[in-house]
Amino acid sequence: HNTTVFQGVAGQSLQVSCPYDSMKHWGRRKAWCRQLGEKGPCQRVVSTHNLWLLSFLRRWNGSTAITDDTLGGTLTITLRNLQPHDAGLYQCQSLHGSEADTLRKVLVEVLADPLDHRDAGDLWFPGESESFEDAHVEHSISRSLLEGEIPFPPTS
């Protein structure tokens, strides 16, 4: 599997999408897990509804949500209030029994908030009728790792 990079800004939400063949994975629950080290296990973060027919319902675990469009074949994971410690390698998985198929390997990169170090005078504030919540735009940039790139830095 190639690794796809998704970049998000600290403090904002990042949406990760994992496309798959809906018939190949028909009846399969899905999961989002975090890779622990280059060869370590993938630790489950959140999985779709126990009833596959209800997979479209968004399920949360802390600040991470998952929802599955089982007909369209797209698994969507939302990382809310992205933090530097969220950076790392993840997997979208399709589950059957005790087995898990990798749908996509994902490298999450967290960019510093460009507004963090500005003077208050430089900030734009939404109008009175709006709130920061309303003005929020989810930010997601994705790319595939280039050949030779490694998702984990070499350990000394």
Partner: antibody, heavy 121, light 107 residues
Framework: EVQLVQSGAEVKKPGESLKISCKGS????????IGWVRQMPGKGLEWMGI????????RYSPSFQGQVTISADKSISTAYLQWSSLKASDTAMYFC??????????????WGQGTLVTVSS | EIVMTQSPATLSVSPGERATLSCRAS??????LAWFQQKPGQAPRLLIY???TRATGIPARFSGSGSGTEFTLTISSLQPEDFAVYYC?????????FGQGTKVDIK
């Protein structure tokens, strides 16, 4: 009507190659996994491996990994099981079966009639 | 690899009687278990999947139960056409594995 039709019986010599087929009809061939099952003379069923014709993703039981190759040609709705060098111990009946996935469990719901492979010098 | 053990190896039953076949897994397979019937010279036929769901066209006299490691196939009243070999198959863990079979013959 869903049907899986397998190629005819084969008699081969040890060391020869062989490719048997399983043609699906009456359903969307690319949307269901096709499995292969071996039954040696007078013995039980053994799960060999499976392929998803939609993207040619093949999985093998460790017992058969490296011994056989499973492939598919979606343009003619046909799955294949092949050997590059047959052994006498490959003598068996080989079945293909369609795997249907669902919320109540998976099922090998339709089976081919079987292909008898005899390997003898 | 999960080992599926079927018992008894042979079951002798009179027509009209009840037959109970057992399948035990070496570790839990949840409810990912199917039962097949095979007659001489024929391909296997799916009877039960998901441990207890009857396949399309299968008579109500066939029923499956169990979960985890212990499973049962019950034929409530054996008909002449039911004398055959029965196999269980787990596909909870890769690779899927069959039991060695139970032959149901006429007493």
């Amino acid at each position: 009507e869903v049907q899986l039709v397998q190629s005819g019986a084969e008699v081969k010599k040890p060391g020869e190659s062989l490719k048997i087929s399983c043609k699906g009809s009456g359903y969307s061939f690319t949307s269901y996994w096709i499995g292969w099952v071996r039954q040696m003379p007078g013995k039980g069923l053994e799960w060999m491996g499976i392929i998803y014709p939609g993207d040619a993703d093949a999985r093998y039981s460790p017992s058969f990994q490296g011994q056989v190759t499973i492939s598919a040609d979606k343009s003619i709705s046909t799955a294949y099981l092949q050997w590059s060098s047959l052994k006498a111990s490959d003598t068996a009946m080989y079945f293909c079966a369609r795997r249907r996935q669902g919320i109540f469990g998976d099922a090998l719901d339709f089976w081919g009639q079987g292909t008898l492979v005899t390997v003898s010098s | 690899e999960i080992v599926m053990t079927q018992s008894p190896a042979t079951l002798s039953v009179s027509p009209g009687e009840r037959a109970t076949l057992s399948c035990r897994a070496s570790q839990s397979v949840s409810s990912n278990l199917a039962w097949f019937q095979q007659k001489p010279g024929q391909a296997p036929r799916l009877l039960i999947y998901g441990a207890s769901t009857r396949a399309t066209g299968i008579p109500a006299r066939f029923s499956g139960s169990g979960s985890g490691t212990e499973f049962t196939l019950t034929i409530s009243s054996l008909q002449p056409e039911d004398f055959a070999v029965y196999y269980c198959l787990q596909d909870n863990n890769f690779p899927p594995t069959f039991g060695q079979g139970t032959k149901v013959d006429i007493k």
